[in-house]
Interface confidence: low
């Protein structure tokens, strides 16, 4: 089946700057600003456009060693990024893939809202484990806040 989870979170960082840092340069930023969550991001195949495969490795002690993400769409105009988790991590006997959509929307106060959609494609009639969704949400929040802190501390970066 397909299970859809949608969440929203806010940031004080303007949409364009956040998209540039969090989405377009996350591969470099995440291991730097959140080494406790991501140990490395390796480009396996492609140039960042659709079809690009990235291997994200987690630190020692994590339940999963790595995941492989496939870039689906990068919309620079609307600050939208779609990617799928296709291997490693929770992908396996019960879960086929996770399709994710992140859209960063500017807010009147100069900050932004991140609208996140996660579609879990389970095999057969398996259901999604609640702790899986929770862990994924927490990881996203950890990375976002780490990037946000970095941007606040480095006002000249990603402008």
């Amino acid at each position: 089946g397909v299970f859809n989870y949608e969440t929203e979170t806010t940031s004080v960082i303007p949409a364009a700057r956040l998209f540039k840092a969090f989405i377009l340069d996350g591969d470099n930023l995440f291991p730097k600003v959140a080494p406790q969550a991501i140990s490395s991001v390796e480009n396996i195949e492609g140039n960042g456009g659709p079809g690009t495969i990235k291997k994200i490795s987690f630190p020692e002690g994590f339940p999963f060693k790595y995941v492989k993400d496939r870039v689906d769409e990068v919309d620079h105009t609307n600050f939208k990024y779609n990617y799928s988790v296709i291997e490693g991590g929770p992908i396996g006997d019960t879960l086929e893939k996770i399709s994710n959509e992140i859209k960063i929307v500017a807010t009147p106060d100069g900050g932004s809202i991140l609208k996140i959609s996660n579609k879990y494609h389970t095999k057969g009639d398996h259901e999604v484990k609640a702790e899986q969704v929770k862990a994924s949400k927490e990881m996203g929040e950890t990375l976002l806040r780490a990037v946000e802190s970095y941007l606040l501390a480095h006002s000249d970066a990603y402008n």
Partner: antibody
């Protein structure tokens, strides 16, 4: 291993009917659009019909509208093509094909990435 | 219907030499999302077709890097940098907006 296996082809008289089946294995059928593509021996490829993941949308080439019906049973990982009013020009090898769209972005597309080996339909008196 | 026209229809090539196949569409395949909805498929003798290139220029998984796709709008090209004996077969372009195939190009070894 990701695989599609067609069955149900055979010899039928003009005006007759056949039901083709396609068994999917190695992946979850409900996550993908599916299509039927046919090929007349020694000729090119012609798309016949396609169906959305949940079966809510179906599209057909003009020449088979009203005669062919595409359907699916995701619980059984199966795709079907019901063909009635068969004509000599429907004689072909029929392929079951997976179309990889990303669920989170319905317009995004990865090609017809898995093909079955085909089943032969012959319409002749 | 969107008509797809391929050329040449027959392509004899010496192993190790490059080869290119042209595909022209009756209308633009450039989607509003910025991608060209044009695929290339290869049907080897006695086999089912296999996907080579999707969205005009993206190589499918497992396809050797000697294959590349280029073009935009209505004019597209499939290039093979160095043809190998295993590349023989019929190459089809296909527009993925309404799923129409070109008539095919038969690549054979000289």
């Amino acid at each position: 291993e990701v695989q599609l296996v067609e069955s149900g082809g055979g010899l039928v008289q003009p005006g007759g009917s056949l039901r083709l089946s396609c068994a999917a294995s190695g992946f979850t059928l409900s996550s993908y659009w599916m299509s039927w593509v046919r090929q007349v021996r020694g000729r090119g490829l012609d798309w016949v019909a396609k169906i959305k993941e949940d079966g809510s949308e179906k599209y057909y080439v003009d020449s088979v509208k009203g005669r062919f019906t595409i359907s699916r049973d995701n619980a059984k990982n199966s795709l079907f093509l019901q063909m009635i009013g068969l004509r000599a020009e429907d004689t072909a090898v029929y392929y079951c094909v997976r179309a990889d769209f990303t669920a989170a972005a319905g317009t995004f597309y990865y090609g017809l990435d898995v093909w079955g080996h085909g089943t032969t339909v012959t319409v002749s008196s | 219907d969107i008509v797809m026209t391929q050329s040449p229809l027959s392509l004899p090539v010496t192993p190790g030499e490059p080869a290119s196949i042209s595909c022209r569409s009756g209308q633009s395949l450039l989607h509003r999302n910025g991608y060209n909805y044009l695929d290339w498929y290869l049907q080897k003798p006695g086999q089912s077709p296999q996907l080579l290139i999707y969205l005009g220029s993206y190589r499918a998984s497992g396809v050797p890097d000697r294959f590349s796709g280029s073009g935009s709008g209505t004019d597209f090209t499939l290039n093979i940098s160095r043809v190998e004996a295993e590349d023989v077969g019929i190459y089809y372009c296909m527009q993925a907006l309404r799923y129409t195939f070109g008539q095919g190009t038969k690549l054979e070894i000289k």
